[in-house]
Amino acid sequence: QNSKLQEELQALRETFSNLTASTDAKVKTLSMQGGNVGRKMKSLESQLEKQQQDLSEDHSSLLLHVKQFVSDLRSLSCQMAVLQGNGSERTCCPVNWVGYEGSCYWFSRSGKPWPEAEKYCQLENAHLVVVGSWEEQKFIQHHVGPVNSWIGLTDQSGPWKWVDGTDYESGFKNWRPEQPDDWYGHGLGGGEDCAHFTEDGGWNDDICQRPYRWVCETQRDRDSGS
């Protein structure tokens, strides 16, 4: 009787030992799997975060494209109306240009030195903006915002001159107090040479190599086929 009990006890011990070993192995496996799941989750979280960011950027980009598309559509409709009417008057501006009074304006987003900015405008059959009135000043100021922006005024050849030949002396001016100072201390020879809108819209003269935004202007009183 006693030896039978001992045999059963031994069998139970073995079963328990096997069960413990099996449980340990399962716990270890689960622990490893848990670690993997944790790592996988972290990886998925970071992927999801990146996808959300990309999606947010795509959404913003898409909105911009839609706005641009609407603007382009308006511009093309206008130009089609001009062509159908066979008129010689150009009442619309090129795509991406903004109309005001008798001119079309293009506002840069990037920055360039004054000579490069003027060259850019010329390639667009335009010139750096010539500000002729307080109304035009306010219109431009509204579009450029609080960022330095080149205008078509320079004294590189001596006296101050507008790029389109408009008379400077008798024309509109909006210099900041004590400007233009035509400061010679920049070591470039000659004065500061180029005029720009400052953050508050007042004009300042500065070194022409500064990388400021710029505004192009072209007349829209004649149809140039654009």
């Epitope: 987003r109 990037s110 920055g111 030195p113 609080p146 960022v147 330095n148 400061w183 201390g185 920049h186 070591g187 470039l188 020879g189 500061e192 500065d206 070194i207 190599q209 500064r210 990388p211 400021y212 935004r213």
Partner: antibody, heavy 120, light 107 residues
């Protein structure tokens, strides 16, 4: 207080990519231009790239042009530098720095830097 | 690109000394010049901008002068915390460029 904290540095093999981040706090991030500047071990400072306050203008040093891309997310107050086709000579401490204005003025606030090591 | 030449590349000085570092540019940059201080293992710290304007919180012992192509940084009375490397940088146009640095060491 005004703070810039870089992250994302590490050891990477030549030809691989890495993306650095710079978290900004204590100021209105969306009104300032931001720059990346690097410093190779035992060397001087080298300007890498600038992005204007609104992301409209980006400029790069010739040494990274076509390989690195600077970007920003103003909603998250974060600046990024995506570095592709990395070379051994890109090994450096990378600092993000705030422009005093929209992007064409001097640097006034710097982060503590994050180290990038390009090695096989 | 605008080249920046700093001199000397290193100098030894004593506490209380007046120290002058010069920076020369390859073309005129007006006053679009900044000065930075960097201590070993630390990020650079902005000292001056527009050649002579002190950043807020920077002590008045630091001063800058110059315009065009020649600039100087002066520390009127050197203190132990001023031993560091100093860099000039032009921001007149892109790419921004730095001088090679001037290491100020204890004599």
């Amino acid at each position: 207080q005004v703070q810039l904290v870089e992250s994302g540095g590490g050891v990477v093999q030549p030809g691989r990519s890495l993306r650095l981040s710079c978290a900004a706090s204590g100021f209105t991030f969306s009104t300032y231009g931001m720059h990346w500047v690097r410093q190779a071990p035992g060397k001087g400072l080298e300007w890498v790239a600038v992005i204007w306050y609104d992301g409209s203008n980006k400029n790069y040093a010739d040494s990274v042009k076509g390989r690195f891309t600077i970007s920003r997310d103003n909603s998250k107050n974060t600046l990024y530098l995506q570095m592709n086709s990395l070379r051994a000579e890109d090994t450096a401490v990378y600092y993000c720095a705030r422009d005093q204005g929209v992007g064409y003025d001097g640097l006034d606030v710097w982060g503590q830097g994050t180290t990038v090591t390009v090695s096989s | 690109d605008i080249q920046m030449t700093q001199s000397p590349s290193s100098l030894s000085a004593s506490v209380g000394d007046r120290v002058t570092i010069t920076c020369r540019t390859s073309q005129g940059i007006g006053n679009y010049l900044a000065w930075f201080q960097q201590k070993p293992g630390k990020a650079p710290k902005s000292l001056l901008y527009k050649a002579s304007s002190l950043q807020s919180g920077v002590p008045s012992k630091f001063s800058g002068s110059g315009s065009g192509t020649d600039f100087t940084l002066t520390i009127s009375s050197l203190q132990p915390e001023d031993f560091a490397t100093y860099y000039c940088q032009q921001y007149m146009t892109y790419p921004l460029t730095f001088g090679g640095g001037t290491k100020v060491e204890i004599k």
